[in-house]
Every structure is written in structure tokens, then in C-alpha cells.
Interface confidence: low
């Protein structure tokens, strides 16, 4: 991707020193998804923008990594900001306007996975299953799964053979997973996050 | 699969330096950061700093400061951990360990290096 | 520093029985914990992080809970293969602490 990366980048670079310190002390304390871990916070006070954005980076991808600092922006009261950088961030992925905030993450059932509160719609509507099999393939699927997803007749029944293998998934697994539903069908997870 | 192969034991006189190694193979070495933990017989596990491969910069346990320097080679993959002014203090297990951040935590560890002080 | 502070030191269980074992933080670490098992001469292996997440691959008889300051692991029907030495260690802040060990035995 690199263009989340650059936009975080970009943002970070353009605060004050004391906008950056405040940054990274809202930092510590503002809500995470469940399974991502919070960046140390002896690390995170002697860092600069570009290592700061490297960890943003390293610990939660780019696509959350820039979910993440526009919220922190917007609870700093950079409200342009945080738009400038969803906006660069979404530049030509179809996805929502920069104006449309996701909803808080309090809204998400506790504990549960953006695949598993989704489930039942997934299997519905996903209709690139071949594409979702083969940026799975080797990582989180084996050839057997792979070949028994494949062998259904119907998208519905394959994403369903497909959850079928999910229970036994950590949130890197899942995670994936919806990495790849993101590239495919980016209008459909961006639909299912504003339900 | 991943792997983090560490150098064999070493034994080495009070006040020398020893330079201690830890090989990564099996995924992308600048894309984690690479911890090093201190174990002495029959005791619990002391981090002593990471060094995050992708920006080069080392983190210490302030009580490792001067007695650890932390550095990396991209081109091995390998991950050094040099000990300096070496006590019987420092005899312990050395362990190197990935420290995969989006859970904090270590997921693969090297099989430890023994190091032994004594004159 | 943040202290954590594990216990007990050691116990023993018969097969079967559920075993816990707590570590408390000196301040709130926010789930940053994760429970590592280390058997003699071997190098420890993570089973739980973020407080409550099993590691792939790690029987689902352990798990892990609490938030704030206060963390447990649970063994629910300790097995033979269970005997070892559990650490807590907690990442929310530099330098990474761990816990005193708690060595758990057969009975």
C-alpha cells in the first residue's frame, strides 16, 4: 500500500513539537481494537515522527495504523487534519468520505472479530471468494482447506466452508482475512462497518 | 518457519567483552522487533532491550545501559547483543526473542546462549 | 519500573485439577500482559497475550483474564506435560517486566 504510511507521515511531520507530545500521550490511553497491542510507552515519548510512524506501522498496519492517528488527531482537536489524512488515505479505494467517521470502537461486540460480528452477511454477500482463497492460501489455509472451499458450488456455500475453518483462527488469521475482503470488495466491509 | 538460531556457549575471562548472536530466517527480519532476555540459574527472565531492525534503534532496560549494546546487520539477518566489562554477574542464559507487536509479545524465541564468567 | 508481582512461587497439582496463577502490575499495564510456560533447560513459549488471547496451537484448557492491575491464568485439567515454570510479562511500558515465576508441579 505506502500511501496510508506516507499520509500518517505527512500528518505527524506537521505538528508542533508539542502536538507531538500530546499526540503521543493520547496515544497510550485511547481505545484499541481488541487483539492489538498498545506501542510501550517508554519507546513511544522518545520517538520522532518517523519512527513514530514506522511503529504506528509496525503494530497496526497501515489501515488501522491511519484509523487510529485521525482519531487521535480528532480527539486533539485537529479536526482538518485527521481529514487530510483519511482523505489521503482513501484516495481512489472507493471507499467513504473522509467526512464519514467510523463508528467508535465501543459500538463493536467486545471480543469479537470484524469476521465474526459479520458473519452471516459475509456469507451473503461476498462474491470474490477465489480472490479471498488465493490471498489466503499458504498463509492461514492449507491445501486441503483450500481445495474443499474451492469445491462448493456457491459463493454462500464456500464462505460458509470457508468460516467453517475460522474458529480455530487468532486475530492475526482474522485479520487477515479481512485485509484481503478490504482489497476485493472494499464497499462491502466499508457498508458493514457503518451498519 | 521461523527461526532464531543463537551462537554457541561462551566462556570468558572478568573484564573482557563477549559478542553474543541470534540468526532470523523465516520471515522478514526489519518488519519485527528483535528483544534479548537475561536468565540466571534457577531465576526468572530480565529484558534487557529490543532493537527494532527497520529503524536501527535500540531500546535498553536502563539497567543494561553500558553493559549491553544491542545492534543488527540487515543483510544477515542476524541480531548481535555485546556484553562488556563482564562480571560473574553476567554469567547467565542468553535469549534472543521476536517481539511481534501486534500483541506484545515474544512468539519465537532462539534456544538460548550460555555465558560463563570466570577467571 | 512497573513491578509485577506473581504468585504463588510454586505449587503442585494432581492431574485434572484446575490450577490458577495471578500476577498483579504496579500500575494498569491495559491488557499489555501475556503468560509465557517454560520447561526445564528449554526456552519459554507464549500462551496467552493481551491478557486473555491463546496463542495458536495452545491447548484451549489454558486461558487468561483480568484487566487493570490484576491478571490470572488458568490451567483447567492439568496434565503431565503442564509441569513447568509460568512467567507473566507485561509490554505497556519500557522496560518490559516480568514476573518472579511460578513453578507448577505433579502431585
Known amino acids: 500500500m505506502g500511501r496510508a504510511r506516507d499520509a500518517i507521515l505527512d500528518a505527524l511531520e506537521n505538528l508542533t513539537a508539542e502536538e507531538l507530545k500530546k499526540f503521543k500521550l493520547k496515544l497510550l490511553s485511547v481505545p484499541l481494537r481488541e487483539g492489538y497491542g498498545r506501542i510501550p510507552r517508554g519507546a513511544l515519548l522518545s520517538m520522532d515522527a518517523l519512527d513514530l510512524t514506522d511503529k504506528l506501522v509496525s503494530f497496526y498496519l497501515e489501515t488501522y495504523g491511519a484509523e487510529l492517528t485521525a482519531n487521535v488527531l480528532r480527539d486533539m482537536g485537529l479536526q482538518e487534519m485527521a481529514g487530510q489524512l483519511q482523505a489521503a488515505t482513501h484516495q481512489g479505494s472507493g471507499a467513504a468520505p473522509a467526512g464519514i467517521q467510523a463508528p467508535p470502537q465501543s459500538a463493536a461486540k467486545p471480543g469479537l472479530h470484524f469476521i465474526d460480528q459479520h458473519r452471516a452477511a459475509l456469507i451473503a454477500r461476498v462474491t470474490n471468494v477465489e480472490w479471498l482463497l488465493d490471498a489466503l492460501y499458504g498463509k492461514v489455509l492449507t491445501d486441503e482447506q483450500y481445495q474443499a472451499v474451492r469445491a462448493e458450488p456457491t459463493n454462500p456455500s464456500k464462505m460458509r466452508k470457508l468460516f467453517s475453518f475460522t474458529p480455530a483462527w487468532n486475530w492475526t488469521c482474522k485479520d487477515l482475512l479481512l485485509q484481503a475482503l478490504r482489497e476485493s470488495q472494499s464497499y462491502l466491509v466499508e457498508d458493514l462497518e457503518r451498519s | 518457519q521461523v527461526q532464531l538460531q543463537q551462537s554457541g556457549a561462551e566462556l570468558a575471562r572478568p573484564g573482557t567483552s563477549v559478542k553474543l548472536s541470534c540468526k532470523a530466517s523465516?520471515?522478514?527480519?526489519?518488519?519485527?522487533?528483535l528483544s534479548w532476555v537475561k536468565q540466571r540459574t534457577g531465576q526468572g527472565l530480565e529484558w534487557i532491550g529490543e532493537?527494532?531492525?527497520?529503524?536501527?534503534?535500540?531500546y535498553y532496560n536502563e539497567k543494561f545501559k553500558g553493559k549491553a549494546i544491542l545492534t543488527a546487520d540487515k543483510s544477515s539477518s542476524t541480531a548481535y547483543m555485546e556484553l562488556r566489562s563482564l562480571t560473574s554477574e553476567d554469567s547467565a542464559v542468553y535469549f534472543c526473542?521476536?517481539?511481534?507487536?501486534?500483541?506484545?509479545?515474544?512468539?519465537?524465541w532462539g534456544q538460548g546462549t550460555t555465558l560463563t564468567v570466570s577467571s | 519500573d512497573i513491578q509485577m508481582t506473581q504468585s504463588p512461587a510454586s505449587l503442585a497439582a494432581s492431574v485434572g485439577e484446575t490450577v490458577t496463577i495471578t500476577c498483579r502490575a504496579s500500575?494498569?499495564?491495559?491488557?499489555?500482559l501475556a503468560w509465557y510456560q517454560q520447561k526445564q533447560g528449554k526456552s519459554p513459549q507464549v500462551l496467552i497475550y493481551?491478557?486473555?488471547s491463546l496463542e495458536d496451537g495452545v491447548p484451549s484448557r489454558f486461558s487468561g483474564s483480568g484487566s487493570g492491575t490484576q491478571y490470572s491464568l488458568k490451567i483447567n485439567s492439568m496434565q503431565p506435560e503442564d509441569t513447568a515454570t509460568y512467567f507473566c510479562?507485561?509490554?505497556?511500558?519500557?522496560?518490559?517486566?516480568f514476573g518472579t515465576g511460578t513453578k507448577l508441579e505433579l502431585k
Open positions: 493481551y491478557a486473555n
Open positions: 526473542a521476536r517481539y511481534f507487536t501486534k500483541g506484545n509479545y515474544f512468539d519465537y
Open positions: 510479562k507485561q509490554a505497556y511500558d519500557v522496560p518490559f517486566t
Open positions: 532493537i527494532y531492525p527497520r529503524i536501527d534503534n535500540p
Open positions: 500500575e494498569n499495564i491495559y491488557y499489555s
Open positions: 523465516g520471515y522478514t527480519f526489519i518488519s519485527f522487533g
